[in-house]
């Protein structure tokens, strides 16, 4: 299907690309001795980039710091020093640049203030950083300002005194709406959820916290949970881990109505040293990791039903370290239903696993064609691809980047990996899949930084090296052929690639510094590929592709979660612009239902290698420990429930006697009748 990657051979060589790129390479040297640089994009398709450089000298008593702020409005080709707009103030980098949601154009920078000041100081902009307003705060912020996703004028922040502060006018005026707050989050419709400690402190009261909600920015409150350890939001679900009455274990409870009613999740309880983690969540379902007892470094992944209550075991021995909290769990955003993660085997080796059906079944990644099994393989002819992600990066293996996929670059996944029986400590190569992870090919030898431009029309890479570099590689055919371009005659110590989020841009910025005897100078090179992709793509440049196709002869080929999708994809041989307005063209078609489209409901399970759900013998005639609040009909079941997001129609419909589970139910969590409302007086 695809050959081994080639570099600078006659493999689709682009005519006079050097001249075209040279004319579109823009250097900017920063008159700056700073030690660190942070970069943020302001808005979508605006071309506005803010760069904050900081220089800190720790002195014996105080530390002297200096910040510089630069702005570009042409995707990084030119920068203007706008430090004067923030009165040459030192900006606290640990708060970063708080960029407003969507295209609000809002930016907040948090300044360093002297020790005795009454409160902090921020600089606010609502015009894409053209102008800033200095505002002194009535509190010292503990966290970055959080924008409401629904209204960017609404902000919340926690203070160093654990106060919850809210602003309704983009930070101009602030009001403390509650004290003793441990954690606060925006929910839907400008709702704020937060935990409060009742007695001592957030740490001391862990497991005895209260979960509160305000729907009117602090005028009135409702206590929606007690004995709370922590809470989280994922998709349309609100989760709380709640301490048990009788011991030190805790359990997950779920609400889909912002905490008015709760149901106990059908998940194992965890002890003091264990944890729950929401790995991924969408409007349909959630992936939940439950840590194993003891310091094992692994746990179990469970996938939920559409209510977030009934869970099916998805993957055992899922790697998730307690120490650094590292997991390799990766949502492959370029193809629906695909996730990659790592498992820790009995012998401590680590293997990569992939699911194509949202956690229904996991398998090893297929060995790339023409690849040899490495020293980790017992059988030199049979092995699989193993992907390096967060865990490898935390172990300081030679892995400069985590796996990359983009929703608008359909099917493309790029990752560092090794081919064997387990993740290897040898220097990895870069692999690419063009079909969402079903098949793989080696893309580049050795570790690289990489990014996707023009919705997959161009892939750019830079070799990871501890020596100065001056070469950028690019491919216009999804990583099959590579051209090398010398972007500067003076090599730089490379620090990062920056391209506009969303992979629609055709500009890439290469960041780094040059170092002479005593000075370090920051420099950026922005390369615009618009002249490489000279023309706009036309109808003939695209070809149809059936996602998840594994057996073209089968009428259910491509069916995942009850439907199949046919995409229009750019031909590898077409060198043209998808363009900024490119929208992924897909044609969905519904599949007939089979038992695979259903999970087992409350009180039912699937015996191994069976497709039918049977009643759990231990529950026959017994009370259910997991319960649902709400209407009675929620507690009737025929043993099956459609998998969240499954769109199948017709075909197999599991019909059987409907049982009433209401009588079997027991739970002692917060009863809605006990919930109390309060006013903020």
């Amino acid at each position: 299907r695809r050959g081994a990657p080639a570099e600078d051979q006659d493999c689709g060589r682009l005519p006079d690309f050097i001249a075209k790129l040279t004319n579109n390479t823009h250097q900017h040297v920063f008159d700056d001795l700073s030690g660190s640089v942070s970069l943020s994009w302001v808005g979508d398709s605006t071309g506005v980039i803010l760069v904050l450089t900081t220089f800190q000298v720790p002195l014996v008593i105080v530390s002297f710091g200096q910040s510089k702020l630069y702005r570009s409005e042409d995707y990084g080709k030119n920068f203007k020093d706008i430090t004067n707009l923030i009165n040459n103030t030192f900006i606290r980098t640990e708060f970063g640049m708080a960029i407003g949601p969507e295209n609000s154009g809002k930016v907040i920078l948090t300044a360093e203030v002297s020790g005795g000041s009454r409160g902090g100081r921020v600089f606010r902009s609502s015009d894409f950083a053209k102008n800033f307003v200095q505002t002194d705060l009535p509190f010292h912020p503990l966290t970055q300002m959080m924008y409401s996703p629904q209204n960017s004028d609404y902000l919340l922040a926690l203070s160093t005194e654990n106060g919850l502060w809210v602003s309704k006018n983009f930070g101009e005026k602030w009001e403390e709406i509650h004290k003793a707050v441990c954690l606060a989050k925006w929910g839907p419709n400008n709702i704020i959820f937060f935990t409060t400690h009742v007695n001592g402190s957030c740490k001391a009261d862990l497991g005895a916290l209260e979960l509160w909600r305000t729907s009117d920015l602090g005028k009135t409150f409702k206590t929606i949970g007690v004995k709370i350890y922590s809470f989280g939001l994922g998709g349309r679900f609100l989760f709380a881990s709640v301490m048990a009455d009788k011991d030190t274990t805790r359990r997950i409870h779920v609400s889909t109505d912002q905490g008015d009613t709760w149901s106990m999740a059908q998940l194992p309880s965890v002890g003091q040293e264990q944890f729950y983690s929401i790995l991924a969540a969408n409007e349909d379902m959630v992936f939940m990791h439950v840590d194993e007892p003891g310091d094992t470094g692994f746990g179990t992944i469970f996938t939920s039903d559409d209510r977030g209550i009934v869970y099916s075991k998805s993957l055992d021995r899922h790697l998730y370290t307690t120490t650094g909290g590292e997991t390799d769990f990766t949502n492959v955003t370029s193809l629906r239903g695909v996730y990659i993660t790592s498992t820790l085997s009995e012998d401590n080796s680590i293997q990569s696993m992939i699911t194509f059906d949202q956690g229904g079944r996991w398998e090893h990644l297929r060995k790339p064609e023409n690849s040899k099994c490495d020293a980790t393989a017992k059988n030199k002819n049979e092995c699989s691809l193993h992907i390096h992600a967060s865990y490898s990066i935390s172990q300081k293996l030679n892995v400069p980047m985590a796996p990359l996929s983009e929703p608008n670059a359909v099917g493309i996944v790029i990752a560092h990996g090794s081919v064997g029986d387990a993740i290897s400590v040898m220097v990895p190569d870069v692999y690419i899949s063009d079909d969402g992870g079903y098949s793989w090919a080696k893309m580049l030898e050795g570790p690289h930084y990489y990014t996707i431009l023009d919705s997959g029309g161009i892939i750019v890479a830079i070799e990871h090296s501890n020596r100065p570099i001056n070469v950028i590689k690019f491919s216009t055919d999804e990583g099959q052929c590579w051209q090398s371009y010398v972007f500067t005659q003076e090599p730089i110590y490379f620090t990062g690639l920056a391209s506009e989020p969303g992979a629609r841009s055709m500009n890439i910025s290469i960041w780094g510094f040059t170092e002479s005897f005593i000075t370090r100078q920051w420099v950026s090179y922005t390369v615009d590929f618009k002249d490489i992709l000279e023309r706009n793509c036309e109808e003939d440049d695209y070809t149809t592709w059936l996602a998840h196709s594994t057996d073209p002869g089968d009428y259910k080929d491509g069916c995942i979660l009850g439907y199949k999708e046919q995409f229009l994809r750019l031909r590898k041989s077409s060198v043209c612009q998808n363009g900024r307005d490119y929208v992924v063209a897909k044609q969905p078609s519904v599949c007939p239902c089979s038992l695979e489209d259903f999970l087992c409901d409350f009180g039912y399970f699937r015996p191994e290698n069976a497709s039918e759900c049977v009643e759990q013998p231990e529950l026959k005639g017994h009370e259910l420990e997991f319960c649902l609040y709400g209407k009675e009909e929620h507690l009737t079941t025929n043993g099956y429930r459609k998998i969240p997001g499954d769109k199948c129609q017709g075909g197999m419909n599991p019909a059987r006697e409907v049982k009433d589970l209401k009588k079997k139910c027991t739970s002692n969590f917060l009863n809605p009748t006990k919930q109390n409302s309060k006013s903020n007086s």
């Epitope: 012998d347 293996l397 029986d421």
Partner: antibody, heavy 121, light 107 residues
Framework: QVQLQESGPGLVKPSETLSLTCAVS?????????WGWIRQPPGKGLEWIGS???????YYNPSLKSRVTISVDTSKNQFSLKLSSVTAADTAVYYC??????????????WGQGTLVTVSS | EIVLTQSPATLSVSPGERATLSCRAS??????LAWYQQKPGQAPRLLIY???TRATGIPARFSGSGSGTEFTLTISSLQSEDFAVYYC?????????FGGGTKVEIK
């Protein structure tokens, strides 16, 4: 075939720092693997000192951690051991070795021939 | 730390006979156990890793078994070059630890 060769002074005075280097041939350290130091007091068993990955990530035996530093020099294709504040109890044959290819495992596939270090005034 | 106890300390066997060496862990090490052979004046040599997998170039007369806390190294028919000290080592949990060794001598 990978080969490892320890080098360094055979005699170190008490309270001083023991310094050893392991030169690797037949394989580039920068291509990966874990590299470790193990010691064996005369007539006794083996004791793991610590391991390092080529990027500099280190793992030490807690009983020696406060005194041990292991570093790597990829340009010279060698890695080193420093053990400070030595006493007579640190007298041993010191071996350097290469670990396995799998992340998460640490047995030793290839060993140097060892070098005897005596701590004495 | 995980303590490995090897037994017997010394094993006297005639050439051609079978030798069985034992290694017991103070807590489960799953299959994370390696065996080494060391001859006087030489560095240790890896024989077995993963409790039962023979290292490259190791003769088939050497075999490893066990998992959890009980492990065995078996030499099916002792050759003259097999008389040496044998060590087990676990890499289940840090710190890596070695057993005290079993000396296999000629009877």
């Amino acid at each position: 075939q990978v080969q490892l060769q320890e080098s360094g002074p055979g005699l170190v005075k008490p309270s001083e720092t023991l310094s050893l280097t392991c030169a690797v041939s037949g394989y580039s350290i920068s291509s990966g693997y874990y590299w470790g130091w193990i010691r064996q007091p005369p007539g006794k068993g083996l004791e793991w000192i610590g391991s390092i990955y080529h990027s500099g990530n280190t793992y030490y035996n807690p009983s020696l951690k406060s005194r041990v530093t292991i570093s790597v020099d990829t340009s010279k294709n060698q890695f080193s051991l420093k053990l400070s504040s030595v006493t007579a109890a640190d007298t041993a044959v010191y071996y350097c070795a290469r670990g396995p290819p799998e992340l998460g495992k640490m047995y030793f596939q290839h060993w140097g021939q060892g070098t005897l270090v005596t701590v004495s005034s | 730390e995980i303590v490995l106890t090897q037994s017997p300390a010394t094993l006297s066997v005639s050439p051609g006979e079978r030798a069985t060496l034992s290694c017991r862990a103070s807590q489960s090490v799953s299959s994370n156990l390696a065996w080494y052979q060391q001859k006087p004046g030489q560095a240790p040599r890896l024989l077995i890793y993963g409790a039962s997998t023979r290292a490259t170039g190791i003769p088939a007369r050497f075999s490893g078994s066990g998992s959890g806390t009980e492990f065995t190294l078996t030499i099916s028919s002792l050759q003259s070059e097999d008389f040496a000290v044998y060590y087990c080592q676990q890499d289940r949990k840090g710190p890596l630890t070695f057993g005290g060794g079993t000396k296999v001598e000629i009877k």
